[in-house]
């Protein structure tokens, strides 16, 4: 059986994404996934 | 020949504030992050932050928001880093370096560093 | 963060021994989509930047010498040379790249 965490591991930076939640920084930009970006 | 290039070293005074530059050339200036990293004498590396000159996006690592503010200025492919507030824990060698990709962030670019000391 | 640690913090080989660091990563940097570790070592010798050797865990940065092979998947990652030279006296740090870059606190390689 897969491991839980398996399922819901989130993806790097550069990854291709279509939601901030899929992503480890919680940043997709661009269906990219970036750094998170400061607000200035 | 891609090349970074850092400012010089830097004596300053706790309280103060610095500002350092590294010079970019020979790649596609705005198409990277460009990524600062610390070290402390002695000790090893730790990431800063990055900007990504081409629409100036700053990420920081937490505990350097406030303490570093990252710049670029495309016309002369050039950013830099200002450390305010300066403490003796500011005291080390900052590298500026990129990665192999826009989004690959192995840092294959380095600049030659600069030394910061912080005394009285 | 991605907590990154290395051991030994240093070791001391004779020339043309085999030589062995390894790093341990707080979580999985294998990326399932297309199976690979985010992972990077470097050499930096006394009084010098840091040099990229290794990246995407196993890859060879173009220049290094084939010594010089990474290995591991997820968790557990290893620097091998395979025949030290005294040239090779540095400290080596890996490095993830799968979320904000963070880096293992070194091993000082020292040449008897």
């Known amino acids: 059986m897969t491991p839980f965490w398996r399922g819901v591991s989130l993806r790097p930076i550069g990854a291709s994404c279509r939601d901030d939640s899929e992503c480890i920084t919680r940043l997709c930009r661009k269906r990219r996934c970036s750094l998170s970006v400061a607000q200035e | 020949e891609v090349q970074l290039q850092q400012s010089g070293t830097v004596l300053a005074r706790p309280g103060a504030s610095v500002k350092m530059s590294c010079k970019a050339s020979?790649?596609?200036?705005?198409?990277?992050?460009m990524h600062w990293v610390k070290q402390r004498p002695g000790q090893g590396l730790e990431w800063i932050g990055a900007i990504y000159p081409g629409n100036s996006d700053t990420s920081y690592k937490q505990k350097f928001k406030g303490k570093a503010k990252l710049t670029a200025v495309t016309s002369a492919s050039t950013v830099y880093m200002e450390l305010s507030s300066l403490t003796d824990e500011d005291s080390a060698v900052y590298y500026c370096?990129?990665?192999?990709?826009?989004?690959?962030?192995?840092?294959?670019?380095w600049g030659q560093g600069t030394s910061v000391t912080v005394s009285s | 963060d991605i907590v990154m640690s290395q051991s030994p913090s240093s070791l001391a080989v004779s020339v043309g021994e085999k030589v062995t660091m390894s790093c341990k990563s707080s979580?999985?940097?294998?990326?399932?989509?297309?199976?690979?570790?985010?992972l990077a070592w470097y050499q930096q010798k006394p009084g010098q930047s840091p040099k990229l050797l290794i990246y995407w865990a196993s890859t060879r940065e173009s220049g290094v010498p084939d010594r010089f092979t990474g290995s591991g998947s997820g968790t557990d990652f290893t620097l091998t040379i395979s025949s030290v030279k005294a040239e090779d006296l540095a400290v080596y740090y890996c490095q993830q790249y799968y979320s904000y870059p963070t880096f293992g606190g070194g091993t000082k390689l020292k040449i008897k």
């Open positions: 020979g790649y596609t200036f705005t198409s990277y992050w």
């Open positions: 370096t990129y990665g192999k990709e826009e989004y690959l962030f192995a840092m294959d670019y």
């Open positions: 979580q999985s940097l294998l990326y399932s989509s297309n199976q690979k570790n985010y």
